[in-house]
């Protein structure tokens, strides 16, 4: 049920129809605050960005692909298997798990376009879903019924 | 079911360069698990999706705009001001705050295109950053220096 017509030129389609400029709007990482000074430490800070103050702290890992829009994606990586105690900010509490929250993000890949006779005609953007981890969340473990 | 007609070249832009194909990949919302049965309750469940098992539980609120791609975005809304106790799953612990994690997501808006003489020439896709709240995170409150 295509609501928006196709962009890659199909047979008999005018290539000037559907255009997306590969613009240079920066895409900042998920958490725009200051990065964790001790990215690998399993502790909850009392200052700094959300990901370092969380009791399920995480760091961001860059995933760059120059043939993708956005070119830069960031994946959260949990720094602790369990949640950190709210009291101390350092001891782990085995009653809570630090779990990744995932999201299937829409991205666009640059692919060669082919004209009517199979000739290369510039580039198409191909829409895809790309799984990214957004954050680590402190959760109660599942109780199996 | 074509809702968005054509995109158009801007002045001096090679029309065959960047074309966008609308394939039919579904774009699921953030958290693919079972929704919270009591969406407004400030408690951490022992089953269900991540957003209901979190000690900083949240619900999702739909933000729909038919002139945007993706048309549907989901904003997290925290169900508790503080974190829920890992032990009970219901009592709040004032030592922890439930804070929203924000992200500037890349979206595309449908805008009228204008030809060289200012004439309307179909529609262009305009890339923008759009602020969404992804999740609620249990954090230690900031200690002001």
């Amino acid at each position: 049920y295509s609501h928006w017509p196709s962009c890659c030129p199909s047979k008999g389609q005018d290539t000037s129809e559907e255009l997306l400029r590969w613009s240079t709007v920066p895409v900042p990482p998920l958490e725009p605050a200051r990065p964790n000074r001790h990215p690998e430490s399993c502790r909850a800070s009392e200052d700094g960005p959300l990901n370092s103050r969380a009791i399920s702290p995480w760091r961001y890992e860059l995933d760059r692909d120059l043939n993708r829009l956005p070119q830069d994606l960031y994946h959260a990586r949990c720094l602790c298997p369990h949640c950190v105690s709210l009291q101390t900010g350092s001891h782990m509490d085995p009653r809570g798990n630090s779990e990744l929250l995932y999201h299937n993000q829409t991205v666009f890949y640059r692919r060669p376009c082919h004209g009517e006779k199979g000739t290369h005609k510039g580039y198409c953007l191909e829409r895809r879903l790309y799984r990214v981890s957004l954050a680590c969340v402190c959760v109660r473990p599942r109780v199996m019924g | 079911y074509s809702h968005w007609p054509s995109c158009c070249p801007s002045k001096g832009q090679d029309t065959s360069e960047e074309l966008l194909r609308w394939s039919t990949v579904p774009v699921p919302p953030l958290e693919p698990a079972r929704p919270n049965r009591h969406p407004e309750s400030c408690r951490a469940s022992e089953d269900g999706p991540l957003n209901s098992r979190a000690i900083s539980p949240w619900r999702y609120e739909l933000d729909r705009d038919l002139n945007r791609l993706p048309q549907d975005l989901y904003h997290a809304r925290c169900l508790c001001p503080h974190c829920v106790s890992l032990q009970t799953g219901s009592h709040m612990d004032p030592r922890g705050n439930s804070e929203l994690l924000y992200h500037n997501q890349t979206v595309f808006y449908r805008r009228p295109c204008h030809g060289e003489k200012g004439t309307h020439k179909g529609y262009c896709l305009e890339r923008r950053l759009y602020r969404v709240s992804l999740a609620c995170v249990c954090v230690r409150p900031r200690v002001m220096g």
Epitope: Y1, S2, H3, W4 | Y1, S2, H3, W22, T24, V25, P26, V27, P28, P29, L30, E31, P32, A33, R34, P35, N36, P39, P49, N51, R59, Y60, E61, L62, R64, L66, N67, L69, Q71, D72, Y74
Partner: antibody, heavy 121, light 107 residues
């Protein structure tokens, strides 16, 4: 074949609450949002809200916030609407309706339940 | 909220007639308009989506047109089973809103 089977008619007392169910079959329940619509006096149709079974994400008509609560049970492919603190104004036929989606875009309520009549008296 | 108005609340026509039902929006809705048919037993079916696209299984005698704020549904050759109430609905912006309905009867 897509089918939405709603629960039967209800007679309820003023001040009470009640829950209407809508069991979906013939399609993947989590792939489509579910809308709820009120029809008073056999005429006007009013959109109540929608829920996405995939993540429980909701959107409500302001006129029904605090009156209707939408939930789903993914395991039984059933959508629910709870109506709270009922008054005579809530007497109506309530419909669930699947929202058509082509993998990108929403377009219409393409399949409707048979309706559930609620009488508050 | 966007208001949808169906000025004609009831309409009488003869079998075989061409019937047009109109609907107007309080602001431009960019063709995001659907038409539904409700039979006397309460059954509701989608006829037309996005102003003019025919839903699967709907007879080709039904068609839709319009733009901006003004839209219409046309039945080219009225059949007995078309006796029903017809509603327009905008989906340009939430909350979705419906017209008041036009009841179609046989002369």
């Amino acid at each position: 074949e897509v089918q939405l089977q709603q629960s039967g008619p209800e007679l309820v007392k003023p001040g009470a609450s009640m829950k209407i169910s809508c069991k979906a079959s013939g399609y993947s329940f989590t792939d489509y949002t579910m809308n709820w619509v009120k029809q008073s006096h056999g005429k006007n149709l009013e959109w109540i809200g929608l829920i996405n079974p995939y993540n429980g994400g909701t959107s409500y008509n302001q006129n029904f916030k605090g009156k209707a609560t939408l939930t789903v049970d993914k395991s039984s492919s059933t959508a629910y609407m709870e109506l709270l603190s009922l008054t005579s104004e809530d007497s109506a036929v309530y419909y669930c309706a699947r929202e058509g989606y082509d993998g990108y875009l929403y377009f219409a309520m393409d399949y409707w339940g048979q309706g559930t009549s609620v009488t508050v008296s | 909220d966007i208001q949808m108005t169906q000025t004609t609340s009831s309409l009488s026509a003869s079998l075989g007639d061409r019937v047009t039902i109109s609907c107007s929006a309080s602001q431009g809705i960019s063709n995001y308009l659907n038409w539904y048919q409700q039979k006397a037993d309460g059954t509701v079916e989608l006829l037309i989506y996005y102003t003019s696209s025919l839903h699967s299984g709907v007879p080709s005698r039904f068609s839709g047109s319009g733009s901006g704020t003004d839209y219409s549904l046309t039945i080219s050759n009225l059949e007995p089973e078309d006796i029903a109430t017809y509603y327009c609905q905008q989906y340009s912006k939430l909350p979705y809103t419906f017209g008041g309905g036009t009841k179609l009867e046989i002369k």
